[in-house]
Interface confidence: medium
C-alpha cells in the first residue's frame, strides 16, 4: 500500500512466482593450446544459457573428474594484472566472462601425438544441476624436450652454477646445425634467486643453452635456513617455432642449524584504521639467540609505524626490538588513502653479547600490510553525451555514450550495476537476444557491447539510470535523440604531408559521426569520387579508390604525394553504410621543402 502521509492507496498484491531453473549449453567448443602453455577459457569457448531472463543468477561450473595433462586455474585478486593463478575445481560463468579461468598444460611427458584432455564438468544454477558436460582441450605436443634434468644441490646462500649436467635440451627433429634453445622462466624460484650473469631472473625472463654451457646461470638461496628446504622453478624451452612442455626444476637447499628463522605474516588493517604489529606477525630468532634489533629501511608510504597509545602524530618509529614485538608496543596506522597495501622494508640484526662478538647476523625482509577497503565513495558519471539513434531503429549503447567511475580502491568500474526504468520511447535489450528487455546490466556489459537500444515512439527522451556499487547509489540521465538515419564526416577534415612523402588517413583525419547501428568497420565504405591530383591513395601497399572504416581504424590507408610543388591537394569521397550515404572532402596540405 502506498501513502503520501495523508491518504493511502488500496492494497495491491505483488505476486512472486519462483520457477525451476533450466540450463542449456550455449557453447562448449573446447580449447587448443601448446603443451606447456596456458590459455584462457572465454565465453566463446564455454557458456550456458538459463531461463532466468533479466536476473543476475549464479552459474557454477564444477570439475567432476581428475585432470590428466594439466590443471584448471582461477585468477585471484579480482583479475588484476599480475594477480596469481591458483588451481581450482570450480568457477562461475562470471569468472569466464572476466577472463579469470584458464587451462594450464603441465604434462612434461614426451608424446608422439597431440593429446586431448576431456574436462568433465557439471553446471549448477540454484538447485538445478546439468551433468556430463565434456569440454575438450587439445594439447599440441611439444617437440623440444629435456635430455637432462638433474636437481641442483646447494648449501645455504652460496651461489651454485647450473651446468649441462643439470639442464640440457634437445629437439626431436634436430637438423645438421644445433638450434639455439631459449629457456623461459615461467615461475621463478621462491626461496632463492636464479641469476644470469648476476642479474636476477623473474617470471617471463630467461637464458639460453649457451648461457648454461658458459656457466652464466647461477642459483643462490635468499636466506640461510635452519632446516633443509626444497625450492623449484618452472620453465619451458623454445627453439622457435618448436616448444617444450612445462618443466619443474628441483633445488635441494641444505640446512644450517644456527640460521635465523623469520616469522613474517601479513598484517590486515582497515582503511583509515590501525593494527598491532606483534611477534605473531614479525619475529626473528635463531638457535642461540632471540635478541634482534629491527631497523626500518624505508618509511611506509600509506601510513606510519607508531608506539601504541601515543598521541603524537608526527613521530615515526624507525627501530624496534623483539621485546617491543613480544609486548605488543608497536602499531601500524593507515592514512585513510584509497590504497590496498603497504610495505615496510627492514633489516633485523642479531645483537652480540659484547662488541668483540662474531660479525652480527642480518635478516632482510619486507613486512607487508593489507588494507581492507571501505566502500566510502559513490559512483560518479564520467561520460555523458546525447545518444543519437535512427528513428525506429536500433543502436549499441556503450561506454562511449555513458560511463561511470568509482574512487574506491579494489573496486573495478566494470562491476557497477546500472538499473533503468520502463521507457516510453523505446527499450533496452540484450544484443544476443533482442526480444528480451533488460533492466539491470553492468558497465562491463556496456564496454563489451552487449546492450542495445531499440527506438520507438517520441523522438526525444531521457533514460533515468540508477548506478550502484553495491552500497552507494547515483542517478544519471541519458538524453536520447532520434532522427532520420545519417552519416556525417566532420567538416574541414585535413591532413599534412611532407613533399614527396606519405600521411596516414585514419579516423582522426576522417572522423565519422552516425546514428546508425554500425557494429563493424567493414559496414562503412568510402569511394573516391574526385582527386587526388598531386598524389595517390594507397591501401595496404596498393593504389586504391575505395576503402572501409576498418581500413581507417587499422591505419591501412595512406595519401602518397608525388613530389610536385603544389602546396595543397583535395579528395572527395562518397561514404556509404547500408542505404545511407553522404559526401566528404579531405584537404591535404603539402609541407614543401
Amino acid at each position: 500500500r502506498v501513502s503520501d502521509g495523508l491518504q493511502a492507496s488500496p492494497p495491491a498484491t505483488l505476486k512472486v512466482v519462483a520457477i525451476r531453473p533450466a540450463i542449456q549449453i550455449h557453447r562448449s567448443t573446447g580449447l587448443r593450446l601448446a603443451q606447456g602453455s596456458a590459455m584462457p577459457i572465454l565465453p566463446a569457448n564455454l557458456s550456458v544459457e538459463t531461463n532466468a531472463v533479466g536476473q543476475d543468477v549464479s552459474v557454477l561450473f564444477r570439475v567432476t573428474g581428475a585432470l590428466q595433462f594439466g590443471e584448471l586455474q582461477k585468477q585471484g585478486a579480482g583479475g588484476v594484472e599480475g594477480a596469481e593463478w591458483w588451481a581450482t575445481q570450480a568457477f562461475h560463468q562470471r569468472d569466464v566472462e572476466q577472463g579469470r579461468v584458464r587451462y594450464l598444460s603441465t604434462d612434461p611427458q614426451h608424446h608422439a601425438y597431440d593429446t586431448v584432455e576431456n574436462l568433465a564438468l557439471e553446471v549448477q544454477v540454484g538447485q538445478e544441476i546439468l551433468s556430463n558436460l565434456s569440454f575438450p582441450v587439445t594439447i599440441q605436443r611439444a617437440t623440444v624436450w629435456m635430455l637432462r634434468l638433474e636437481p641442483l644441490h646447494t648449501q645455504n646462500t652460496q651461489q651454485e652454477t647450473l651446468t649441462t649436467a643439470h639442464l640440457e635440451a634437445t629437439l626431436e627433429e634436430a637438423g645438421p646445425s644445433p638450434p639455439t634453445f631459449h629457456y623461459e622462466v615461467v615461475q621463478a624460484p621462491r626461496k632463492g634467486n636464479l641469476q644470469l650473469q648476476g642479474t636476477r631472473l623473474s617470471d617471463g625472463q630467461g637464458f639460453t643453452q649457451d648461457d648454461i654451457q658458459a656457466g652464466r646461470v647461477t642459483y643462490g638461496a635468499t636466506a640461510r635456513a635452519s632446516e633443509a628446504v626444497e625450492d623449484t622453478f618452472r620453465f619451458r624451452v623454445t627453439a622457435p617455432p618448436y616448444f617444450s612442455p612445462l618443466y619443474t626444476f628441483p633445488i635441494h637447499i641444505g640446512g644450517d642449524p644456527d640460521a635465523p628463522v623469520l616469522t613474517n605474516v601479513l598484517l590486515v588493517v582497515p582503511e583509515g584504521g590501525e593494527g598491532v604489529l606483534s611477534a605473531d606477525h614479525l619475529f626473528v630468532k635463531s638457535l642461540n639467540s632471540a635478541s634482534y634489533l629491527y631497523e626500518v629501511m624505508e618509511r611506509p608510504r600509506h601510513g606510519r609505524l607508531a608506539w601504541r597509545g601515543t598521541q603524537d602524530k608526527t613521530t615515526m618509529v624507525t627501530s624496534f626490538t623483539n621485546e617491543d614485538l613480544l609486548r605488543g608496543r608497536l602499531v601500524y596506522q593507515h592514512d585513510d588513502s584509497e590504497t590496498t597495501e603497504d610495505d615496510i622494508p627492514f633489516v633485523a640484526t642479531r645483537q652480540g653479547e659484547s662488541s668483540g662478538d662474531m660479525a652480527w647476523e642480518e635478516v632482510r625482509g619486507v613486512f607487508r600490510v593489507a588494507i581492507q577497503p571501505v566502500n566510502d565513495h559513490a559512483p560518479v558519471q564520467t561520460i555523458s553525451r546525447i545518444f543519437h539513434v535512427a528513428r525506429g531503429g536500433r543502436r549499441l549503447l556503450t561506454t562511449d555514450d555513458v560511463a561511470f567511475s568509482d574512487a574506491d580502491s579494489g573496486f573495478a568500474d566494470a562491476q557497477l550495476v546500472l538499473t533503468r526504468k520502463d521507457l516510453l520511447f523505446g527499450s533496452i535489450v540484450a544484443v544476443d537476444e533482442p526480444t528480451r528487455p533488460i533492466y539491470r546490466f553492468t558497465q562491463e556489459d556496456l564496454r563489451k557491447r552487449r546492450v542495445l537500444f531499440v527506438h520507438s515512439g517520441a523522438d526525444r527522451g531521457w533514460i533515468q539510470l540508477q548506478v550502484s556499487d553495491g552500497q552507494h547509489q547515483a542517478t544519471a540521465l541519458l538524453e536520447v535523440q532520434a532522427s532520420e538515419p545519417y552519416l556525417r564526416v566532420a567538416n574541414g577534415s585535413s591532413l599534412v604531408v611532407p613533399q614527396g612523402g606519405q600521411g596516414t588517413i585514419d579516423t582522426a583525419v576522417l572522423h565519422l559521426d552516425t546514428n546508425l547501428d554500425i557494429r563493424s568497420g567493414d559496414e562503412v565504405h568510402y569511394h573516391v569520387t574526385a582527386g587526388p591530383r598531386w598524389g595517390q591513395l594507397v591501401r595496404a601497399g596498393q593504389p586504391a579508390t575505395a576503402f572501409s572504416q576498418q581500413d581507417l581504424l587499422d591505419g591501412a590507408v595512406l595519401y602518397s604525394h608525388n613530389g610536385s610543388l603544389s602546396p595543397r591537394d583535395t579528395m572527395a569521397f562518397s561514404v556509404e553504410a547500408g542505404p545511407v550515404h553522404t559526401d566528404a572532402t579531405l584537404q591535404v596540405t603539402i609541407a614543401l621543402e
Partner: antibody
Framework: EVQLVESGAEVKKPGDSLKISCKGS????????IGWVRQMPGKGLEWMGI????????TYSPAFQGDVTISVDKSISTAYLQWNSLKASDTGIYYC???????????WGNGTLVTVSS | QSALTQPASVSGSPGQSITISCTGT?????????VSWYQQHPGKAPKLMIY???NRPSGVSNRFSGSKSGNTASLTISGLQAEDEADYYC???????????FGTGTQLTVLG
C-alpha cells in the same frame, strides 16, 4: 641422401615369430619418429604405430596393439617391427617411414613383403 | 576409427584437371590442418605429394595442389600426364586413439 632401407621378404608359417628391420641413413636417426604402415594385398594403407628413436617412446594404433612390438637400436640407426605369433592375416607389405613435423611421412622404406601361409 | 572416405577411382584425359576428395569428420580432417597426400605407383612405396593441407615438398610438380573445406580435403592435379596414373591416399591426424588415419585410396587412370 636420406634413406630408409628395409630387410628382405620373408615367408613364414602361422605361429612363427618374426622381426623385420628398417635402417636409417643420411640424417640424425634419433631425432625423427619412425612409423610403420601395413598394406595388405590389393588393399590400402593402414597405420600401425610409431617410435621415437631418441628415447624409444612408442605409440600403437589400437588395431595393432598387443599383436606387434615396435623397437629401436639407436646405436645402429635401426627400427624393428616384431611378431611373436604370426597369423595368415598378417600377410602384406610393411613399410617404415620417417615422420616429419605435423604428422606426415616424408621418406619411406622400400617395403618388406611378409607372407604367412601353412 | 574408420578410414577417411575417398572415391574408389577417378579418370581424366592428358592435359585435363581432376580433383580427388577425402572426407572425414571434425575429429580429423575438419579439426586439424594436418592432411597429407601420397602417390603410390604399382609395386612401389608411397611418395609424399602434399603436407599440412596445401604445402608441396621440394621436387613435387606445382601441378599438384591441396585444399580443405570443412571436413573434406581435396587434391587437384592440373595438366594431367601419363605418369600421374597411380593410387592416391590422403591421411590425417585424428584426435581418436588411432592418432593417424589413411584414406581408402583412389585409383587415378589417365585415359588414351
Amino acid at each position: 641422401e636420406v634413406q630408409l632401407v628395409e630387410s628382405g621378404a620373408e615367408v613364414k608359417k602361422p605361429g612363427d615369430s618374426l622381426k623385420i628391420s628398417c635402417k636409417g641413413s643420411g640424417y640424425s636417426f634419433t631425432s625423427y619418429w619412425i612409423g610403420w604402415v601395413r598394406q595388405m594385398p590389393g588393399k590400402g594403407l593402414e597405420w600401425m604405430g610409431i617410435i621415437y628413436p631418441g628415447d624409444s617412446e612408442t605409440t600403437y594404433s589400437p588395431a595393432f596393439q598387443g599383436d606387434v612390438t615396435i623397437s629401436v637400436d639407436k646405436s645402429i640407426s635401426t627400427a624393428y617391427l616384431q611378431w611373436n605369433s604370426l597369423k595368415a592375416s598378417d600377410t602384406g607389405i610393411y613399410y617404415c617411414a620417417r615422420r616429419r613435423g605435423n604428422y606426415y611421412m616424408d621418406v619411406w622404406g622400400n617395403g618388406t613383403l611378409v607372407t604367412v601361409s601353412s | 576409427q574408420s578410414a577417411l572416405t575417398q572415391p574408389a577411382s577417378v579418370s581424366g584425359s592428358p592435359g585435363q584437371s581432376i580433383t580427388i576428395s577425402c572426407t572425414g569428420t571434425s575429429s580429423d580432417v575438419g579439426g586439424y590442418n594436418y592432411v597429407s597426400w601420397y602417390q603410390q605407383h604399382p609395386g612401389k612405396a608411397p611418395k609424399l605429394m602434399i603436407y599440412d593441407v596445401s604445402n608441396r615438398p621440394s621436387g613435387v610438380s606445382n601441378r599438384f595442389s591441396g585444399s580443405k573445406s570443412g571436413n573434406t580435403a581435396s587434391l587437384t592435379i592440373s595438366g594431367l600426364q601419363a605418369e600421374d596414373e597411380a593410387d592416391y591416399y590422403c591421411s590425417s591426424y585424428t584426435s581418436s586413439s588411432t592418432r593417424y588415419v589413411f584414406g581408402t585410396g583412389t585409383q587415378l587412370t589417365v585415359l588414351g
